[in-house]
């Protein structure tokens, strides 16, 4: 059985393959009840959290999760040795740096203790899954009397991410966004100056070191105005 | 003439699920990021969520995050609200509004009810 | 989050009169405020943005003012159809948007 993992906002990430083995009988068994599916993420290549819902279950079960990397020199099959819980139900299973293997094929098994023919197996690709801390430390200089460049710093590579850039001033109705590659800057070359700006930076893994499709939280906002110009004419950072 | 007119409405049971959707006209859709405001009876006016002009970003507001899904065709000038795990604190006229956070158009709203 | 607080709540008013709401929030938000006007069944209706600036189609009897954490809705002289609801918004450091509670404008 072929399936595709959907990405939270929506996006096909990975494909997956699900092996059910099932007991060869004419009665439904509980061991032919499918098993949740799980999702995957890597924060900042700190620490990943795989994840289920365990709700879904038709009675409560604590579901157990092995995980290995195929073809490599991580192929022994470990147990997860950090589970996260919902309602004293494991929903989850944390893994530390040290055991994320980005280039490598990674595989998660699910199973069903008390049915252990009962088990689902998915193969993800974790540079795809990949989703970066948001961008921080936002500062903007004014270049000239109209230019503004907005810069900003990430805890991770520089050069594996992407961004987008959200601005607006207090007379818009929307935001206006513009991506931006690796080199985390971007410049306003015509500034309002009885206007106030606000601009805001995401980051995502994609697309020189990963393929990822979800993006990091937006930073804090930093704002930028007539009032406030005048105290520092070449830099000024506010955060809200 | 700015038309937003909003259906999906109805009664639905705690926990239950509705779709609402926002039918816009009169202006040029894909260059206003759109919002939901609600309003709970004799109450005032509440942000829920709001999408940007391409639809590739949202926010919401903690009473809803996880909860609620925002989305919008741009194709056929519309927006919409995925409400699921609706709750009695849900029951509200909901609007739809242009802009991301200055709401310069409004339609009359939907009434959504959760009551057991 | 952003806490914006409207005084009076409410207020009683005769046409002609000149009248003022007052926003205050609960920190700085420059000049990222809006006021709508709402009546009874109907749909609200901006009529400032940015503090200041009146909305396309808006009577210029309506203005608003200030900057930083107060703000002020000033109608300068009362017309029948200006009693209704009024409600400033603050657009400064979102999500979330907050608006302030509410100031209902009743006839004298």
């Known amino acids: 059985l072929n399936t595709t993992i959907l990405t939270p906002n929506g996006n096909e990430d990975t494909t997956a393959d699900f092996f059910l083995t099932t007991m060869p009988t004419d009665s439904l068994s509980v061991s032919t009840l499918p098993l949740p599916e799980v999702q995957c993420f890597v924060f900042n290549v700190e620490y990943m959290n795989c994840t289920w819902n365990s709700s879904s279950e038709p009675q409560p079960t604590n579901l157990t999760l092995h995980y290995w990397y195929k073809n490599s020199d991580n192929d022994k099959v470990q147990k997860c040795s950090h589970y996260l819980f919902s309602e004293e139900i494991t929903s989850g299973c944390q893994l530390q740096k040290k055991e994320i293997h980005l280039y490598q094929t990674f595989v998660v098994q699910l199973q069903d203790p008390r049915e252990p023919r009962r088990q689902a197996t998915q193969m993800l690709k974790l540079q795809n899954l990949v989703i970066p801390w948001a961008p921080e430390n936002l500062t903007l200089h004014k270049l000239s009397e109209s230019q503004l460049e907005l810069n900003w710093n990430n805890r991770f590579l520089n050069h594996c991410l992407e961004h987008l850039v959200q601005y607006r001033t207090d007379w818009d109705h929307s935001w206006t966004e513009q991506s931006v590659d690796y080199r985390h800057k971007f410049s306003l070359p015509s500034v309002d100056g009885q206007k106030r700006y606000t601009f805001r930076v995401r980051s995502r893994f994609n697309p020189l070191c990963g393929s990822a499709q979800h993006w990091s939280e937006w930073s804090h906002p930093i704002h930028w105005g007539s009032n406030t110009s005048k105290e520092n004419p070449f830099l000024f950072a506010l955060e809200a | 003439e700015v038309q937003l007119v909003e259906s999906g409405g109805g009664v639905v049971r705690p926990g239950g699920s509705l779709r609402l959707s926002c039918a816009a006209s009169g202006f040029t859709f894909d260059d206003y990021g759109m919002s939901w405001v609600r309003q709970a009876p004799g109450k005032g006016l509440e942000w829920i969520s709001s999408i940007n002009r391409n639809g590739g970003s949202a926010d919401y507001a903690d009473s809803v995050k996880g909860r609620f899904t925002i989305s919008r065709d741009n194709a056929k000038n519309s927006l919409f609200l995925q409400m699921s795990s609706l709750r009695a604190e849900d029951t509200a006229l909901y609007h739809c509004?242009?802009?991301?956070?200055?709401?310069?158009?409004w339609g009359q709203g939907t009434l959504v009810t959760v009551s057991s | 989050d952003i806490q914006m607080t409207q005084s009076p709540s409410s207020l009683s008013a005769s046409v002609g009169d000149r009248v003022t709401i007052t926003c205050r929030a609960s920190?700085?938000?420059?000049?990222?405020l809006n006021w709508y006007q709402q009546k009874p069944g109907k749909a609200p209706k901006l009529l400032i943005y940015?503090?200041?600036s009146l909305q396309s189609g808006v009577p210029s009897r309506f203005s608003g003012s200030g900057s930083g954490t107060d703000f002020t809705l000033t109608i300068s002289s009362l017309q029948p159809e200006d009693f209704a609801t009024y409600y400033c918004q603050q657009s400064y450091s979102t999500p979330p948007i907050t608006f302030g509670q509410g100031t209902r404008l009743e006839i004298k």
């Open positions: 920190q700085s938000i420059s000049s990222y």
């Open positions: 940015a503090a200041s």
């Open positions: 509004a242009s802009g991301e956070f200055r709401f310069d158009y």
